[in-house]
């Protein structure tokens, strides 16, 4: 198993608009972030 | 709509093998990380695996208890994930199924008895 | 591995009542960045999971803001302020931020 904080947190997951770096790789390859446009169902944290 | 679709479940005897498949529609896939979970008959949630999208080299991971038995894997062009599960065994007898952790599939029944 | 210890097991709630599910890490879910990566689902019966709370305490959308998450790095809470009748099923709570993922082991909501 890799190392799961190796450069990014596993568990910074999906919310558009919050990507800033590697911790953020899960939102860069959500469904949710996949979608573009539309309706996205979870709204980025305030 | 986000669609995840899983299918290939059945009843087998331990020893087997079995292969999942979850097509999906609805986004666009090649670069989406999806996962495995499985629910047990005691109603147990347990991350089997994940894989990750093309430019992350379509990496794998697992969970320690299954590895080296379960192996993930997609094909691009299907826009499908796979769950290849051998020598299964009769605790490998769950609900499985595919899930962005965001959208999740309606899930595929294993059963695993001899 | 990081364990999730929920509690309770079960819950009878009278429609109207509030309801309240803890859940305790043995980790700190804390990420770098200062994110806490704690997650409830909720399955309903003969249903799929469904997120509820993402990050400790965001509403996911199209989730009633009956419900709402806190808590801190290792202590978490679910609370259901007015419990209906769709809220019953097996509630659970989860974190992504270390391999392997993990899944408390479930809280399931009945009604009185």
């Known amino acids: 198993l890799a190392d799961p904080l190796d450069h990014r947190d596993a568990g910074d997951l999906w919310f558009p608009g919050e990507s800033e770096s590697f911790e953020d790789a899960h939102v860069e390859h959500s469904i949710s972030r996949s979608l573009l446009e539309g309706e996205i169902p979870f709204p980025p944290t305030s | 709509e986000v669609q995840l679709v899983e299918t290939g479940g059945s009843l087998v005897q331990p020893g087997r093998s079995l292969k999942l498949t979850c097509a999906t529609s609805?986004?666009?896939?090649?670069?989406?990380?999806l996962h495995w979970i499985r629910r047990s008959p005691e109603n147990q949630l347990e991350w089997v695996g994940q894989?990750?999208?093309?430019?992350?080299?379509?990496?794998?991971y697992y969970a320690e208890s299954l590895q080296g038995r379960f192996t993930i894997s997609r094909d691009d062009s299907e826009r499908s994930i796979y769950l290849q599960m051998n020598n299964l065994k009769e605790e490998d007898t769950a609900i499985y199924y595919c899930?962005?952790?965001?959208?999740w599939g309606q899930g595929v029944m294993v059963t695993v008895s001899s | 591995d990081t364990v999730l210890t929920q509690g309770p097991l079960s819950v009878s709630v009278t429609p109207g009542e509030s309801a309240s599910i803890s859940c305790r890490s043995s980790?700190?879910?804390?990420?770098?960045?200062?994110?806490?990566?704690l997650y409830w689902y909720l399955q309903k019966p003969g249903k799929s999971p469904q997120l509820l709370i993402y990050?400790?305490?965001n509403l996911a959308s199209g989730v009633p803001d009956r419900f709402s998450g806190g808590g801190s790095e290792t202590d978490f809470t679910l609370k259901i302020s007015k419990v209906e009748t769709e809220d019953v099923g097996v509630y659970y709570c989860a974190q992504f931020l270390q391999y392997p993922y993990t899944f408390g082991a479930g809280t399931k909501l009945e009604l009185k």
């Open positions: 899930t962005g952790l965001d959208y």
């Open positions: 990050r400790m305490s």
């Open positions: 894989i990750k999208g093309k430019s992350d080299n379509y990496a794998t």
């Open positions: 609805g986004f666009t896939f090649t670069n989406v990380w």
């Open positions: 980790k700190s879910l804390l990420s770098s960045k200062g994110i806490t990566s």
